[in-house]
């Protein structure tokens, strides 16, 4: 039985050219996290595997950095980065948990800084 829940940063916004941390946290389960996949819509961004460490998709290497922890840092943001991001936790023995984050990248310098994981 899957008892865990994924907590995410939810809906967040950031300024064009800036950086943001995408963060998910799995709680309420003793399942072992074997791998976390990060996806943007239909693109695999990065994978963090308990044995193999991080793999960043080559096409995102310049703008995506691993961490902190199982999170993902997006840099040099553009308006095209606006959209849904998913953290997919592969666990044993529970199975798969998925969290969703919506990022809005704003042209303006008055982007709301509501996310506690945001990089200034």
């Amino acid at each position: 039985m899957m008892t865990g829940t994924i907590e995410t940063t939810g809906n967040i916004s950031a300024e064009k050219g800036g950086s943001i941390i995408l963060q998910c946290h799995l709680s309420s389960t003793t399942a072992q996290v074997t791998q976390v996949n990060w996806e943007q819509q239909d693109q695999l961004l990065a994978i963090c595997n308990a044995d193999l460490g991080w793999h960043i998709s080559p096409s995102f290497k310049d703008r995506v950095a691993p961490g902190p922890g199982l999170g993902l840092t997006l840099q040099s943001l553009t308006v095209n980065d606006t959209g849904e991001y998913f953290c997919i936790y592969h666990t044993y023995p529970d199975g798969t948990y998925t969290g969703r984050i919506f990022l809005e990248v704003l042209e303006s310098s008055v982007a709301e800084h509501g996310a506690r994981f945001q990089i200034p």
Epitope: T34, Q43, I47, L52, H55, S57, Y92, P93
Partner: antibody, heavy 118, light 107 residues
């Protein structure tokens, strides 16, 4: 250099059993998921089974479920496929494969031929 | 199970030609799509993983694109050593499934 060397193939009668082995070297075997993929003569590739890095999780194609068992011994750097109740349609070259991040197959063995025939 | 449909099943081309092979999934597989090359009597070789990432050591004339359900493998300028059979494979969910293959032959 990564190497995967399969063994254990051969001729077996329908209903018989075989145990395939795959000896791995050149990498940290215990860190990688491993899979078996087969190819019938003149046909395409068919996934058979996979196992997680620590052996805790396994999965099978419907065509072999209940007949084949995948296992691994990380202390011996070896992957196994126990094949029971073999059928003519199991005749194929069986490849052992390394699967980083459980997403792509980056290394394949040379394959071992299993022939099921009376 | 996710079905992978590859087309064409075979094609004839000349050295220097641009070759395109397509692969369609029966449901969305995000970018969990890999491409392999196989020559007769040999094990398959990874070309492209995660839809568009070029495997280390593979010539840059090979490229992959697509996401969701539709994917493409392109060989920008076919070389003599590229005549082989190409397979797509999804790793979105088990059972992992392969396309039926595309045999690239010399015209």
């Amino acid at each position: 250099e990564v190497q995967l060397l399969e063994s254990g193939g051969g001729l077996v009668q329908p209903g018989g059993s075989l145990r395939l082995s795959c000896a791995a070297s050149g990498f940290t075997f215990s860190s990688y998921a491993m899979h078996w993929v087969r190819q019938a003569p003149g046909k395409g590739l068919e996934w058979v089974s996979g196992i997680s890095s620590n052996g805790g999780s396994t999965s099978y194609a419907d065509s072999v479920k209940g007949r084949f068992t995948i296992s691994r011994d990380n202390s011996k750097n070896t992957l196994y496929l126990q094949m029971n109740s073999l059928r003519a349609e199991d005749t194929a070259v069986y490849y052992c494969a390394r699967v980083p991040y459980s997403v792509w197959i980056d290394y394949w063995g040379q394959g071992t031929l299993v022939t099921v025939s009376s | 199970d996710i079905q992978m449909t590859q087309s064409p099943s075979s094609l004839s081309a000349s050295v220097g030609d641009r070759v395109t092979i397509t692969c369609r999934a029966s449901q969305s597989i995000s970018s969990y799509l890999n491409w392999y090359q196989q020559k007769p009597g040999k094990a398959p070789k990874l070309l492209i993983y995660a839809a568009s990432s070029l495997q280390s050591g593979v010539p840059s004339r090979f490229s992959g694109s697509g996401s969701g359900t539709d994917f493409t493998l392109t060989i920008s300028s076919l070389q003599p050593e590229d005549f082989a059979t190409y397979y797509c494979q999804q790793s979105y969910s088990t059972p992992l499934t392969f396309g039926g293959g595309t045999k690239v032959e010399i015209k």
